[in-house]
Interface confidence: low
């Protein structure tokens, strides 16, 4: 397994409808064409998998149906959103690349962006 | 033409390892990877996993990590794999077989060996 | 990983007919997909890569098709060494995963 370098963004602030999306690069050592990215969570000294696709170079990044992250790749960076987000999802979200194929095998961890999610404050009822 | 010449038949004991070869003859070893693959009754054919024997490097199927260690030898045309702390299960014919370098695409496995088959019995 | 299941498991058909094998992937693979025939006692030979190419000196009576996650193989005018068992893999992320197999026998 060789390391390879990944850079991400150290601060993104979720939107008030619960959207934070940020830039993961690697820096690519070889011809790679299957890519696996998968975006862990650390809160608590625990670390949780948030969602993880695998995508052909060219191709679409394509997560599972029921995964509240979407993404899109340019060469080697990935576009990821995380939606569906609330207060208590504030964390550190580590992008994690992996290049599968062809071999040799490449592993790369960023240092993981701090997504601060703020609950939108609920509207105060209003008398008619 | 292309050959892949795989070594002969084993019978082993459990728990005991064993080292597959396949000799390659007919193109330039080091422009096509190398893939293993295991044939079973019960579970059909299973991608092992492949090396560059350009450079050593090597993609495993998560399932035969630590049971599969594949390694060539430039010198003479020829993988290896190495199957370790063998039971049952690893009873099977294995194949190699060669890819096309860096193809995601029409590179496929086009030329295979014999196979080898492993019993595993005490 | 991607699962292949291919169908039928068996099929018995005589010389002149034609057989038609499928293949569905659990997810999309692109047209990743390759047919190989494996005669007993021997190893798979290439018949069709990208879904629908025949590999080299492979007749014109087979014939590969299909996109997405639905996948299949056609066999004209069968010939006695058309009998055999066949298989499906795909090439779209490691693992590459095979189908369960296609047993074509001589009715």
């Known amino acids: 397994c060789k390391a390879m370098h990944v850079a991400q963004p150290a601060v993104v602030l979720a939107s008030s409808r619960g959207i934070a999306s940020f830039v993961c690069e690697y820096a690519s050592p070889g011809k790679a064409t299957e890519v696996r990215v998968t975006v862990l969570r650390q809160a608590d000294s625990q670390v949780t998998e948030v969602c993880a696709a695998t995508y052909m170079m060219g191709n679409e990044l394509t997560f599972l149906d029921d995964s509240i992250c979407t993404g899109t790749s340019s060469g080697n960076q990935v576009n990821l959103t995380i939606q569906g987000l609330r207060a208590m999802d504030t964390g550190l979200y580590i992008c994690k690349v992996e290049l599968m194929y062809p071999p040799p095998y490449y592993l790369g961890i960023g240092n993981g962006t701090q997504i601060y999610v703020i609950d939108p404050e609920p509207c105060p009822d209003s008398d008619f | 033409q292309v050959q892949l010449q795989q070594s002969g038949a084993e019978l082993v004991r459990p728990g005991a390892s064993v080292t597959l070869s396949c000799k390659a003859s007919?193109?330039?070893?080091?422009?096509?990877?190398m893939h293993w693959v295991k044939q079973t009754p019960v579970h059909g054919l299973e991608w092992i996993g492949t090396?560059?024997?350009?450079?050593?490097?090597?993609a495993y199927n998560q399932k035969f990590k630590g049971k599969a260690t594949l390694t060539t030898d430039k010198s003479s045309s020829t993988a290896y794999m190495e199957l370790r702390s063998l039971t049952s299960e690893d009873s099977a014919v294995y194949y190699c077989?060669?890819?096309?370098?860096?193809?995601?695409?029409?590179?496929?496995?086009?030329?295979w060996g014999q196979g080898t088959s492993v019993t595993v019995s005490s | 990983d991607i699962q292949m299941t291919q169908s039928p498991a068996s099929l018995s058909a005589s010389v002149g007919e034609t057989v038609t094998i499928t293949c569905r992937a659990s997810?999309?693979?692109?047209?990743?997909l390759a047919w190989y025939q494996q005669k007993q006692g021997k190893s798979p030979q290439l018949l069709v890569f990208?879904?629908?190419t025949l590999a080299d000196g492979v007749p014109s009576r087979f014939s590969g098709s299909g996109s997405g996650t639905q996948y299949s193989l056609k066999i004209n005018s069968l010939q006695p060494e058309d009998f055999g068992n066949y298989y499906c893999?795909?090439?779209?992320?490691?693992?590459?995963?095979f189908g369960g197999g296609t047993k074509l026998e001589i009715k």
């Open positions: 077989t060669r890819r096309g370098k860096y193809g995601n695409y029409d590179y496929v496995m086009d030329y």
């Open positions: 007919g193109y330039t070893f080091t422009d096509y990877e």
């Open positions: 090396i560059d024997p350009e450079t050593g490097g090597t």
């Open positions: 997810g999309n693979i692109h047209n990743y």
């Open positions: 990208n879904a629908k």
């Open positions: 893999q795909h090439f779209w992320s490691t693992p590459w995963t």
